[in-house]
């Protein structure tokens, strides 16, 4: 089964993306309180870099990560290959699906999270996440985040 | 219009086979992960089956493990059930699911 493509350019992710929910096949030590809007600026060679701001336990996390192209459409590595990333698109319009596998905190983890260009959440989208969680094997509750667009330590 | 039609229910004796498959229109197919649920009479509907849209990763509820199989064909537009050595307790109505959209059901009776 072919990945879908998502085109030869990554233009098409750029931009500001809403983290709507995530999950993973195990608990996730920290969980966030709220996040700010995922920016993805497309970079030469095809390669993206990702920002984001969580508020975990009233500490505001700053994250930048690099997600580096790869001959496969839509696959990436991150921290120096020791994670894998895969961005396709849902059905549902401006909506995206990130899924990843490879170490966080010293152990294997394999998480998704749902990306979309508007704040509101879309029952259509997050079913088709539900689902897509559910394939994979992901079986912790999944997590419908706060939106902010800014953060702000000790409160939202 | 998006739409999600299930065929190749019947009745069938234990120990036998069946292949449910649903087409489903209206949406782009291939983006979309499908599941396979079912309901049996005077019980809440439970989740048999799932399959990715990225990979075609499957997963099963336990009770099915080793007996069903879910796949699918992009082209055309078909997700798959095969149920094999069927039991009494797999006595339902099979749905098809795809996001928040579920199909009418067909019906599997597995009796001697």
């Known amino acids: 089964q072919d990945t879908p493509a998502l085109g030869k350019d990554t233009v098409a992710v750029s931009g500001k993306w809403y983290l709507k929910a995530m999950t993973a096949d195990q608990e996730v030590p920290e969980k966030p309180d709220s996040v700010t809007p995922m920016i993805l600026k497309a970079q030469k060679g095809g390669n993206l870099e990702a920002k984001i701001t969580m508020l975990t336990n009233g500490q505001c996390q700053n994250i930048t990560v690099v997600l580096h192209k790869t001959s496969e459409p839509g696959k990436y590595t991150a921290y120096e290959g020791q994670r894998v990333v895969f961005i396709q698109p849902s059905p549902v319009r401006d909506h995206y699906i990130l899924y990843c596998e490879g170490e966080l905190h010293g152990r294997q983890i394999r998480m998704a999270k749902l990306l979309g260009r508007d704040p509101e959440q879309s029952q259509e989208a997050l079913e088709d996440f539900r689902e897509f969680s559910r394939a994979k094997g992901l079986n912790q509750e999944i997590l419908e985040l706060a939106q902010s667009e800014t953060c702000s330590p000790g409160g939202q | 219009q998006l739409q999600l039609v299930e065929s190749g229910g019947g009745l069938v004796q234990p120990g036998g086979s069946l292949r449910l498959s649903c087409v489903g229109s209206?949406?782009?197919?291939?983006?979309?992960?499908m599941g396979w649920y079912r309901q049996a009479p005077g019980k809440e509907r439970e989740w048999v089956a799932s399959?990715?849209?990225?990979?075609?990763?499957?997963n099963y509820a336990d009770s099915v493990k080793g007996r069903f199989t879910i796949s699918r064909d992009n082209a055309k537009r078909m997700v798959y059930l095969q149920m094999n050595n069927l039991k009494s307790e797999d006595t339902a109505v099979y749905y098809c699911?795809?996001?928040?959209?579920w199909g009418k059901g067909t019906q599997v009776t597995v009796s001697s």
């Open positions: 699911k795809a996001m928040n959209y």
């Open positions: 209206g949406f782009t197919f291939s983006l979309a992960s």
């Open positions: 399959i990715s849209s990225l990979d075609a990763s499957t």
